[in-house]
Interface confidence: low
């Protein structure tokens, strides 16, 4: 089975998570992409997705999540603003390519959000709670009508080092199944 690695981000409440998921340019530029959470090795739950087909550099906002797909660079930029402790968890970017299974981009993101420093609101210089301006956006498309058990996996052990290439075929059928708590993808 494909082994997955994690990249850890430790941030304070109110800060912004800003990550970039690389993809194979020619193959996936206009494909619809999504940002998912997997809590404690549970089944992925889609939180936000780009439009279909994905628009170049067009920000899509769902709640506190902003996605921007840069076709020219082959990367999906994901920002989660005004982070809360409850946002802590394991995240991943996926590319939808129906009728095939969604294609998972490596590495997964392990987000740890801790309480900010006590003090006056906004006193933490890294806080984006009051200064971050979310660009005006419109989201025309719901996330895909597609849920894939194939990407359901246990979070890998911390020592895992093997990384699949972005355009490799993912087959996770032999990975232990998970307990599903935030219920469905």
């Amino acid at each position: 089975a494909t082994k997955l690695t994690e990249e850890k981000y430790e941030l304070k409440e109110g800060q912004t998570l800003d990550v970039k998921c690389d993809y194979t340019l020619e193959k996936f530029a206009s494909s619809q992409k999504a940002w998912q959470i997997i809590r404690d090795g549970e089944m992925p739950k889609t939180l936000a997705c780009t439009e279909r087909p994905s628009k170049n550099s067009h920000p899509v906002q769902v709640g506190r999540i902003i996605l921007e797909d840069y076709h020219d660079h082959g990367l999906l930029r994901v920002r989660m603003v005004n982070l809360q402790v409850e946002d802590s968890g394991l995240y991943q970017c996926v590319i939808y390519q129906p009728p095939k299974e969604p294609h998972m981009l490596f590495d997964r993101i392990r987000l740890v959000v801790t309480k900010g420093f006590s003090g006056t609101p906004g006193s933490n210089e890294n806080s984006t709670q009051n200064v971050y301006k979310i660009p005006p956006t419109t989201t025309k498309a719901l996330c895909p009508l597609y849920t894939s058990p194939r990407t359901v996996t246990q979070a890998p052990p911390k020592s895992t080092a093997d990384v699949s290439t972005p355009d490799s075929e993912i087959n996770l059928t032999n990975v232990t199944d998970i307990i599903r708590v935030p219920v469905f993808n």
Epitope: V62, R64, I65, T147, S148, P149, V152, D177, F184
Partner: antibody, heavy 119, light 113 residues
Framework: QVQLVQSGAEVKKPGASVKVSCKAS????????MHWVRQAPGQGLEWMGW????????KYAQKFQGRVTMTRDTSISTAYMELSRLRSDDTAVYYC????????????WGQGTLVTVSS | DIVMTQSPDSLAVSLGERATINCKSS????????????LAWYQQKPGQPPKLLIY???TRESGVPDRFSGSGSGTDFTLTISSLQAEDVAVYYC?????????FGGGTKVEIK
Amino acid sequence: QVQLVQSGAEVKKPGASVKVSCKASGYTFTGYYMHWVRQAPGQGLEWMGWINPNSGGTKYAQKFQGRVTMTRDTSISTAYMELSRLRSDDTAVYYCARERHSSLGYAYWGQGTLVTVSS
Amino acid sequence: DIVMTQSPDSLAVSLGERATINCKSSQSVLFSSNNKNYLAWYQQKPGQPPKLLIYWASTRESGVPDRFSGSGSGTDFTLTISSLQAEDVAVYYCQQFFLAPPTFGGGTKVEIK
């Protein structure tokens, strides 16, 4: 179009087992979890569990742990739900169900299978 | 488990009048990251499986008449039928999809007065 077709009604004695099938068509069977929900006569809906048709992995409601077994045969796109040690209060209509959107509700349902447990 | 409590148990409304069904969850089903409530509403007619009407608490499923609307957030939700039609006579259920196991409300029977 997506269709879930279930097996016919069953009459069982207390202590016996029943196995209900749910044949899927119109979509990639291994691409979506299959859920089972039951409804006793005149009562509400009760989630029993799900199976990942791709891996065969399952999750069962605590109430049914040890009595329910969910399996699948991918070669014929069919999911199965077996309930053992039947009691009279297991008399119910058993449904298989599938989401369309992820985490957003069951858009597709089987027609239901009535299981009657009576001595 | 999250407990879903529906009220009233039954409701009699005149044709063309508004029907309102309430659903309360024992804990919030709002996912703060995307500001979505993982709550669905179903309609079930006798001898038929349930039919999905609303998901994300307020988004109508494709093909559902616009007289059906859902509202609410967190723990308190409402399904409204703005102008009751004869074909709306059914039992209505809410269901949370936020935490496993997914749980249903006890149902509300809607009849014509």
